[in-house]
């Protein structure tokens, strides 16, 4: 996988006027890395792993850049003509990548109320937009505004591309994203499901990178997909990930079942614990689209694009 730096900024408007704050999250190699929110942007490292490696200068620089980007995005939202009553959002996602062969890619995407309406390849400066008429109207509106804005010149887009890559290279050089491997902790629990049945849940947590195989086996043979329920692989806030898989089995047959885990070339199997059945209230609760972002997203049901 390539190394990547991803900026995700969102601004909101209510009843025709743009709100003063903005939300931003920066992901480094797919992991939450920095965060800014509300009125005052203060770039905060996401998890000890980032804080330990990078100094205050980084946060100051990113805070300055993100604040500038947030201001630009608010101005863009103010120029969108079809704003109706109620709450609206404009989201900009900017990504740059460095591949193994040292080739680079950069792109920028705009979403209005959670719907993609405009994308740009920052290297070729080529714009693309979806087919829907609403999206095209929005896209033309925003494109024209960006072109009119003296800041949004050819050099500006080149600078966005170059700056993103410069930051990414700086982070890579710092060693914050060494291609490290953190093995998961695997934990198997059981809970009463219904008469004569139990639900067994296998949780893997604290692993990096995010790719993992987690499945239930009966007598050493993988259960079919339709008899298992998987949780999403989610960041746990420490630069690592967590996930789970569950299945329902007959009580008394626990010895036949094992949880199989494979991660970064290593594997393990984990039996179902015997003894007293533990009653668990629920599986991990998570919101796939929100990833623990600001409450405002949850309250307003604004979709967060990953």
């Amino acid at each position: 996988e390539p190394h990547s730096l991803r900026y995700n900024l969102t601004v909101l408007s209510g009843d025709g006027s743009v709100q003063s704050g903005f939300l931003a999250e920066v992901h480094l190699d797919g992991q939450p890395f920095l965060r800014c929110d509300r009125q005052k942007c203060r770039a905060k490292p996401q998890g000890q792993w980032a804080e330990d490696v990078l100094g205050n200068k980084t946060w100051d620089r990113e805070t300055r850049d993100l604040t500038g980007n947030g201001k630009d995005l608010r101005m863009t939202l103010a120029h969108i003509k079809d704003q109706k009553e109620g709450l609206h959002s404009l989201q900009e996602i900017r990504v740059c990548e460095i591949h193994e062969d040292n080739s680079t890619r950069s792109s920028q995407h705009f979403y209005y109320d959670g719907e993609l309406f405009l994308s740009q390849n920052l290297e070729t400066e080529e714009w693309t937009m979806p087919q829907s008429s609403r999206a095209q109207t929005l896209a033309m509106n925003v494109r024209n505004f960006l072109k009119e804005d003296a800041m949004k010149t050819k050099t500006h887009y080149h600078a966005m591309h170059a700056d993103c890559l410069q930051e990414l290279r700086r982070y890579l050089k710092s060693g914050v994203v060494l291609r490290r491997t953190v093995p998961p902790m695997v934990n198997v629990t059981r809970s009463e499901a219904s008469e004569g049945n139990i639900t067994v849940t296998c949780r893997a947590s604290g692993f990096y990178p995010w790719n993992i195989t987690l499945s239930w086996r009966q007598d050493g043979v993988s259960l079919s997909h339709d008899t298992q329920q998987w949780g999403d692989v989610l960041p746990d806030g420490n630069g690592t990930y967590q996930t789970w898989v569950a299945t329902r089995i007959c009580q008394g047959e626990e010895q036949r079942f094992t949880c199989y885990m494979e991660h970064s070339g290593n594997h393990s199997t984990h039996p179902v614990p015997s003894g007293k059945v533990l009653v668990l209230q629920s599986h991990w609760q998570h919101h796939h689209h929100h990833h623990g972002l600001n409450d405002i997203f949850e309250a307003q049901k604004i979709e967060w694009h990953e």
Epitope: R217, D219, G220, V221, S222, Q255, R256, T258, Y260, H267, S268, T269, H270, P271
Partner: antibody, heavy 118, light 107 residues
Framework: QVQLQQSGPELVKPGASVKVSCKAS????????IYWVKQSHGKSLEWIGY????????VYNQKFKGKATLTVDKSSSTAYMHLNSLTSEDSAVYYC???????????WGQGTLVTVSA | DIQMTQTTSSLSASLGDRVTISCRAS??????LNWYQQKPDGTVKLLIY???RLHSGVPSRFSGSGSGTDYSLTISNLEQEDIATYFC?????????FGSGTKLEIK
């Protein structure tokens, strides 16, 4: 390719014990269970039990509990079946098998003939 | 224990014939039925798993079908190398149990 190489034939006296080995190659040994099956002369097959090489967990056919003990040596990718208190009823060909994770008894060893005779 | 019954203990057929071997379980085994081939030298190979799934490398002339308690293995075009004993086996309930085998011979 997956291979299971079993130890050679054994001639043992009644009351004695025997240890049959099954050396696995061509795959990650601790990834898949090893199963053991008995075939008495001219008869059908009987499942003895299986072992998870990763953690040593075993499941036995009730009929063979106390007769067979399954173990593994991860360092040499070898599974063992120890048979004790042998009688003529234990004379048979014993097979080890493994799985590909999708089907039982996917790959089989060549079999080990155990003869119990005074 | 679940009893697996292969009523035909031996079967004679000519090369090129279509041959069907049947197997019955004493109770519903939910399609957890596998077929194995044992050559005269004792070598055992998996042919079919989960009633009808062909194991990799097994010729397509072999097929399996069935449900509930009744299952069958079909060889569509018998070849010399198919001379062997065929066993069915259920994997639904412990202990795993095998049929008594059907020995296939050439007429």
């Amino acid at each position: 390719q997956v291979q299971l190489q079993q130890s050679g034939p054994e001639l043992v006296k009644p009351g004695a014990s025997v240890k049959v080995s099954c050396k696995a190659s061509g795959y990650a040994f601790t990834k898949y269970n090893i199963y053991w099956v008995k075939q008495s002369h001219g008869k059908s097959l009987e499942w003895i039990g299986y072992i998870d090489p990763y953690n040593g967990g075993t499941v036995y056919n009730q009929k063979f509990k106390g007769k067979a003990t399954l173990t593994v040596d991860k360092s040499s990718s070898t599974a063992y079946m120890h048979l004790n208190s042998l009688t003529s009823e234990d004379s048979a060909v014993y097979y080890c098998a493994t799985t590909d994770g999708y089907s039982l008894f996917t790959y089989w060893g060549q079999g080990t003939l155990v003869t119990v005779s005074a | 224990d679940i009893q697996m019954t292969q009523t035909t203990s031996s079967l004679s057929a000519s090369l090129g014939d279509r041959v069907t071997i049947s197997c019955r379980a004493s109770q519903d085994i939910s399609n957890y039925l596998n077929w194995y081939q044992q050559k005269p030298d004792g070598t055992v190979k998996l042919l079919i798993y989960y009633t009808s799934r062909l194991h990799s490398g097994v010729p397509s002339r072999f097929s399996g079908s069935g449900s509930g308690t009744d299952y069958s293995l079909t060889i569509s075009n018998l070849e010399q190398e198919d001379i062997a004993t065929y066993f069915c086996q259920q994997g639904n309930t412990l202990p795993f149990t095998f049929g008594s085998g059907t020995k296939l011979e050439i007429k």
